[in-house]
């Protein structure tokens, strides 16, 4: 299709080489009458409308994204060629930063319902640059935490070093929806609830003598509880002896509850104590079996191919640890009688 009629938007993504961050493009289809797609939209390309993330369709996945190759080749369907770019409804998610993401991205409705709809498309020219030696050492992170029940704020990473007075008008989105009342470089939250969690996008306009473009940053906001003050506790095994049958395979499970920690490095290991020797056993990876805001339950199993006489004279020790401390639980095997 002819993309010359598409409205154009220029975006800049300045990414930090220190941290993992994501980026999003919204399919900002012009919808002055809030109609379905761009039906009867007679705007010329020069009359750029107020862009809003497209919310007019009942089926929000009814858009198609393309990338325009720089060498003039035909448009490429994003889904087929770019595994690190994911389409979610009307939004394009870039999972990894890098200058190779620079380029022109076009979105348009999948269903063309009238001749007027042909021009219903948006071309986004994305420039991606690594952050130069930051003039601001402590720029806000692309991953921010809000403590439940307290006050907090969400800062726009690209503007976090500017005072509120200097800051340009900022447009904020949460999970793709415009937050119309927020215009500052910081969103202040009086009391944090779990619904404040989500993907926030902040946009502001930067201009030079030639052109203007939108500077965009994405912030993943997590609502958290305070760090635990407790060492982990072992939920299983509870008993320190376990009846077993000689010659049969055996799996002993260790389940431990770890309280929330912002920097979470749980340790769960099995040791064998054989008289006065003790060594760590190579066992399958630990797995999380339940995760809530407050805590996480992690399980790790030790597997014996068959229980031997010697195993009855050993102790199997589960060791768990977080930043506060550690806990152990040992299990002695006992032969089943009769």
């Amino acid at each position: 299709f002819n993309i010359s009629g598409c409205s154009t938007k220029k975006l800049l993504w300045t990414y930090s080489t220190r941290s993992e961050e994501e980026f999003v493009l919204f399919c900002d289809l012009p919808e002055p009458q809030k109609s379905h797609f761009c039906h009867r939209n007679r705007l010329s390309p020069k009359q750029v409308p107020e862009h809003l993330p497209f919310m007019g369709s009942n089926d929000l996945s009814d858009v198609q994204w393309y990338q325009q190759p720089s060498n003039g080749d035909p448009l490429e369907d994003i889904r087929k060629s770019y595994p690190h770019i994911i389409q979610d409804k009307c939004t394009l998610h870039f999972l990894t930063p890098g200058v190779n993401n620079s380029g022109s991205y076009i979105c348009r409705p999948k269903m063309i319902k009238s001749p007027y709809d042909v021009a219903c498309c948006v071309k986004m020219i994305l420039e991606v640059k690594p952050q130069t030696n930051a003039s601001c050492e402590y720029s806000a992170s692309h991953k921010q935490d809000l403590l439940l029940g307290s006050t907090g704020s969400i800062s726009c990473p690209s503007l976090s070093c500017q005072s509120d007075a200097q800051s340009p008008a900022v447009t904020w989105y949460k999970n793709g929806k415009l937050l119309s009342v927020e215009r500052s470089n910081r969103i202040v939250v009086d009391e944090v609830y779990d619904y404040h969690q989500g993907t926030y996008v902040c946009d502001y306009t930067q201009s030079d003598t030639v052109s203007s473009w939108t500077v965009r940053a994405v912030v993943q906001v997590r609502t958290i509880v305070g760090d635990t003050k407790l060492k982990p506790d072992i939920l299983d095994p509870v008993e320190d002896t376990l009846e077993v049958e000689l010659g049969k395979p055996l799996t002993i499970s260790c389940k431990a509850r770890f309280g929330f920690e912002r920097v979470f490095n749980p340790v769960i290991k099995w040791y064998i104590k054989d008289s006065d020797l003790e060594w760590e056993v190579s066992v399958p990876e630990a797995k999380s079996i339940k995760s809530t805001l407050k805590d996480e339950i992690i399980e790790r199993n030790i597997i014996l191919e068959k229980v031997t006489q010697r195993d009855l004279r050993r102790k199997f020790v589960c060791f768990v640890q977080n930043s506060i401390g550690n806990t152990t639980q040992s299990v002695q095997l006992k032969e089943k009688r009769g």
Partner: antibody, heavy 111, light 110 residues
């Protein structure tokens, strides 16, 4: 540490009980407490063990029947020997597997 | 019953030299590595050198090196010193029963 006691000069056919006294560690932690002997000028020979936390015992094939290992308190293990012969003459060591040995006690069987 | 066969015996080497002692088990030791090496001098109890086939016991010089798996094990003593003159024993721990001692290897340092 470990210390053996009870070594003596006895006549063939006699019985004798050796005692191993432990200090500085707890039997409840679960150790193999074993007896090993060494005849003069010969190598080490394993006799039998008791697992200190649950009392399980096991023996070398040749020692079954004549030798009995028991835990008599939270710090002592004994070796009862019956029908002794001159071939049983040896230094008897108490061994906490794998690292701790007593100095040994000498048993001499002679008429 | 398990049998541990040690070879050779005796073995002699000059100060600064290297000796290698082999230990073969009639069946695999527990976990394929539950084997220890001891040094014994006359009138003394044995002293632990190596456990779990290759782990050096605390305070033992790194000149002593253990290796092996399953049924075949080796103790190597390099940069031999006069004080290394002693009898060396391998000891295996087994899944089905208890322990077995090798017959011992006397190391003579010239």
């Amino acid at each position: 540490s470990l210390e053996e006691s009870g070594g003596d000069l006895v006549k063939p056919g006699a019985s004798l009980t050796l005692t191993c006294t432990a200090s500085g560690f707890s039997f409840s932690s679960g150790y193999d407490m074993c007896w090993v002997r060494q005849a003069p000028g010969k190598g080490l020979e394993w006799i039998g063990c008791i697992y200190s936390s649950n009392g399980l015992t096991w023996y070398a094939t040749w020692a079954k029947g004549r030798f009995t290992v028991s835990k008599t308190s939270s710090t002592t293990v004994t070796l009862q020997m019956t029908s002794l012969t001159a071939a049983d003459t040896a230094s008897y060591f108490c061994w906490r597997v794998w690292s701790l040995w007593g100095p040994g006690t000498l048993v001499t069987v002679s008429s | 019953a398990q049998v541990l066969t040690q070879t050779p015996s005796p073995v002699s080497a000059a100060v600064g030299g290297t000796v290698t002692i082999n230990c073969q088990s009639s069946q695999s030791v527990a976990d394929n590595n539950l084997l220890a090496w001891y040094q014994q001098k006359p009138g003394q109890p044995p002293k632990l050198l190596i456990y779990k086939a290759s782990t050096l016991a605390s305070g033992v010089p790194s000149r002593f090196k253990g290796s092996g798996y399953g049924t075949q094990f080796t103790l190597t003593i390099s940069d031999l010193e006069c004080d290394d003159a002693a009898t060396y024993y391998c000891v295996g721990g087994y899944s089905t029963s208890g322990y077995a001692f090798g017959g011992g290897t006397e190391v003579v340092v010239k």
